[in-house]
């Protein structure tokens, strides 16, 4: 059996000619709708029946998941890291073996030194957040520790961090030059051996709101497109309105397929609409152009 | 945690001897690094020696070389301050302070831990 739906409808015409018949309403909602056979066989796309209606994957929606998205959230990080691999040679401490076992009372108190000079070393960087000693070993003391630095996410994040690790790298660099041993003793909090100082590596967090987007978008990838409201990324199609991708499709309806965006152009009692972008119109009785 | 407890602190004639000691609990191991600061009124608190409990080293500050003696008793877990030719500029309240580490910085902010202090008045 069938369950029909009774809606007025109105006629829709794609920028190729081919009128289709659609709901005013909605036009993602069927006419008629089988309750009968294999529900699973109804869900398009990859899409499931859930028991109740059918679950879709990004980017599809509708009650058979034929129809396409106009956005596609994507949630870039709050926060976005760096983390500097970086080692020191302080010389204001001898190295005993208690130092290579993290829960010993020495390791501990050297910890809470080494942290409270890196603290004071950086204390001018925004984007800092600590150092973590990694190892301890022979030579006075080679400190052998990450430098973690976080920023709030914004499109030129990368920029942000780089500076970042340059301040880093010139701190640290001055610190180990100006606080050294006198006379086989040391005046700072720590003193360090200017030639031990080195970068090891840099890892930047990577986050591509355009990878992202695309890989979200599946065979859709070359039609939708990242555009920043607010510093903050949307994944959208060009029949997402209010940005400056968007097509207007005028006396028309937006609609993705795998060519790309189309306008499908309505036709009302008076009027009929053509073009690609909906912005011919003709009057049914007198036959002629206005624009 | 390290605890320290000083002792031997007094008046004392200029030219005259006092002898300060310091008890040390608390350390997990027998290699540490243990000092004597001082702090005079109005002046920031300077080292006067500190030692290392394994003999590797020892430290005394230029104003009190040929005087001041550092010692410790490992056995006691015990730091001395033999003090001897006092002057009148050796008038301070005395700190004791101790690192789990093998300290070599006269900076009293790297080390961690302190004794409550003890009184020396040198005067006629």
């Known amino acids: 059996p069938l369950a029909t739906i009774p809606v007025s409808t109105t006629s829709l015409t794609s920028s190729e000619g081919s009128t289709i018949s659609t709901p005013s309403v909605d036009i993602s909602t069927p006419v008629t709708t089988s309750i009968v056979g294999d529900q699973c066989s109804r869900c398009k796309n990859g899409g499931f029946w859930d028991g109740l209606k059918c679950q879709c994957l990004t980017p599809y929606y509708g009650e058979s998941c034929e129809e396409v998205v106009n956005s596609i959230d994507i949630a870039p990080p709050e926060t976005v890291s760096a983390q500097m691999e970086l080692t020191v040679t302080v010389t204001s401490v001898k190295f005993t073996d208690e130092l290579k076992n993290h829960s010993s009372q020495e390791f501990r108190e050297f910890n809470k030194t080494f942290t409270e000079q890196m603290n004071i070393v950086y204390s001018g960087i925004p984007e800092y957040v600590g150092v973590n000693i990694t190892n301890l070993r022979l030579g006075s003391v080679v400190v052998e520790h990450d430098v973690l630095l976080r920023t709030k996410y914004t499109p030129e994040y990368k920029t942000a961090l780089d500076n970042a690790t340059e301040v880093v790298k010139q701190k640290i660099t001055k610190v180990t030059t100006e606080q050294i041993m006198t006379n086989d003793n040391c005046s700072a909090l720590m003193c360090f051996n200017t030639t031990g100082t080195q970068v090891q590596n840099i890892t930047v967090t990577q986050y591509d709101p355009v990878e992202e987007c695309r890989q979200k978008a599946e065979e859709y990838e070359d039609y939708f497109l990242v555009e920043y409201r607010d510093q903050k990324p949307y994944c959208i199609s060009p029949c997402e309105s209010g940005f400056n991708a968007s097509k207007n499709c005028n006396h028309g309806k937006c609609q993705m397929s795998q060519n790309g965006a189309r306008c499908l152009c309505v036709t009302t009692e008076t009027h009929w609409y053509s073009g690609e972008d909906c912005n011919q119109g003709t009057q049914k009785s007198h036959h002629h152009h206005h624009h | 945690d390290v605890q320290l407890v000083e002792s031997g602190g007094g008046v004392v004639q200029p030219g005259g001897s006092l002898r300060l000691s310091c008890a040390a609990s608390g350390y997990t191991s027998n290699r540490y690094s243990m000092a004597w600061f001082r702090q005079a009124p109005g002046k920031e608190r300077e080292v006067v020696a500190f030692i290392w409990t394994d003999g590797g080293r020892t430290y005394y500050a230029d104003s009190v070389k040929g005087r001041l003696t550092i010692s410790h008793d490992n056995a006691k877990n015990t730091l001395y301050l033999q003090m001897n030719s006092l002057r009148a500029e050796d008038t301070a309240v005395y700190y004791c302070?101790?690192?789990?580490?093998?300290?070599?910085?006269?900076?009293?902010?790297?080390?961690?831990?302190w004794g409550q202090g003890t009184m020396v008045t040198v005067s006629s």
């Open positions: 302070a101790a690192s789990s580490l093998l300290l070599q910085t006269i900076n009293p902010r790297a080390w961690p831990y």
